[in-house]
Amino acid sequence: LMGGQDKPFLSARPSTVVPRGGHVALQCHYRRGFNNFMLYKEDRSHVPIFHGRIFQESFIMGPVTPAHAGTYRCRGSRPHSLTGWSAPSNPLVIMVTGNHRKPSLLAHPGPLLKSGETVILQCWSDVMFEHFFLHREGISEDPSRLVGQIHDGVSKANFSIGPLMPVLAGTYRCYGSVPHSPYQLSAPSDPLDIVITGLYEKPSLSAQPGPTVQAGENVTLSCSSWSSYDIYHLSREGEAHERRLRAVPKVNRTFQADFPLGPATHGGTYRCFGSFRALPCVWSNSSDPLLVSVTGNPSSSWPSPTEPSSKSGICRHLH
């Protein structure tokens, strides 16, 4: 991690992917410490601010412009050497986002997957991007990069993620770059949450007043478990979104969430999952499916009494 013999290690916090106008801290780690260091940009563009300047512990760059994108290296202070400086560090690529229209990001077969499965994340755009980049929120490593395939006026790339483990769950975004500006990326795609299920014991799902109800009757689905889940997620077969609620401890030592569905119109098959606050994208096994039947004259689909989560937002904490 820390580079070789006389080589410092240059890293970026929080990430090498920086939005236009944002800030990033560059750290040059040399000889088991953060010493004084000098910075260089390989293409020498834009950075008069570096020339002859010595930085202490970290360099805060920003607000960044497209011209900040590129490859950086540092040299650590080495007072007793001939030059006074170490060998150059590893190259660090800083990518600046927000320079072109955002691409779209889709998951095949879908964003809800079992542990061990593989998912294809497809990034596509009608902008002729040469490369696509896939980045997971909260990690400082460089994003994955693929060459875009152009077909019928659309450029796209398929990123294969798997076999899925808890560490791969999270919020993904993709970006595109055009030829000649490889590190000036597009605006981010809408976030896509990849959720891994099957890691903990399944909760139980029940309906009040029961699974068979009269049209117009109020129905509540209760998800509960002996496991101390923080959040429960309720999904309905055929619907893209899920609802979530905070789990409440009950006197019988179970943890429960009650989802009010409102007046019954259409039935459906429901499942619920539990998750912990620390790993919001890692869910339990699915509860046994619960078929809710509505007798009488169904009109339209069931109303949503609460604002449903869309394909994104699942991996954010529920405050």
């Epitope: 916090r13 929080p14 106008g21 944002g22 800030h23 990033v24 801290a25 750290q27 953060f34 834009h46 008069p48 601010i49 300047r53 930085f55 202490q56 512990e57 970290s58 360099f59 805060i60 760059m61 920003g62 607000p63 412009t65 011209a67």
Partner: antibody
């Protein structure tokens, strides 16, 4: 959205100390620094120095070395300016502003008026 | 220290006029110049940095240009809400230094 909220006005006697706070929100506090700028009555803007919120290392302009101290409490995303042995000429509005090694100050606090008078 | 000499110190313009404020650095500052707007009773607001990069949310009637020691802020069609003091600042080398300010008034 990025916001910097400074503590209220202060009236102090010569020789006293004052501590001005600047609470940041809307961004990751440790990825940027905090610059401090003084605006004395009838004068322009004068850069006092800054503190790197990632490393905690402060840097002071020549005229502000000695009685002026920058500090941080990253747990509450707050930067502080402490001035000791106050003099009448320290009477000014003090601004905090987000910025890093490149010296661009992209968001500013509302300013804190410090009046030094006997 | 780098001295930033700003001119004029005061200007009066009519709504719709093109307004130009200049700043001269005492040495080459390699395009590391920012411009700020300070309205009465408010803190300064960043308009432009690296000579010509507009900050988020800044109207496109504000533009910056220049190189070497000479830099310009232009308001292509001044509006009533642009009444303020405008400051240039070099961010080439510490200590960062500001110009003396230009007060813009609407006739």
């Amino acid at each position: 959205q990025v916001q910097l909220v400074q503590s209220g006005s202060e009236l102090k006697k010569p020789g006293a100390s004052v501590k001005v706070s600047c609470k940041a929100s809307g961004y990751t506090f440790t990825t940027a620094g905090m610059q401090w700028v003084q605006k004395s009555p009838g004068q322009g803007l004068e850069w006092m120095g800054w503190i790197n919120s990632h490393s905690g290392v402060p840097k002071y302009a020549e005229d502000f070395k000695g009685r002026f101290v920058f500090s941080l409490d990253t747990s509450v995303s707050t930067a502080y300016l402490q001035i000791s042995s106050l003099k009448a000429e320290d009477t000014a509005v003090y601004f905090c502003a987000r910025g890093g090694d490149e010296g661009v100050m992209d968001y500013w606090g509302q300013g804190t008026t410090v009046t030094v008078s006997s | 220290d780098i001295v930033m000499t700003q001119s004029p110190s005061f200007l009066s313009a009519s709504v719709g006029d093109r307004v130009t404020i200049t700043c001269k650095a005492s040495q080459d500052v390699s395009t590391a110049v920012a411009w700020y707007q300070q309205k009465p009773g408010q803190p300064p607001k960043l308009l432009i940095y690296w000579t010509s990069t507009r900050h988020t949310g800044v109207p496109d009637r504000f533009s910056g240009s220049g190189s070497g020691t000479d830099y310009t802020l232009t308001i292509s069609s001044v509006q009533a809400e642009d009444v303020a003091v405008y400051y240039c600042q070099q961010h080439y080398s510490t200590p960062w230094t500001f110009g003396g300010g230009t007060k813009v008034e609407i006739k």
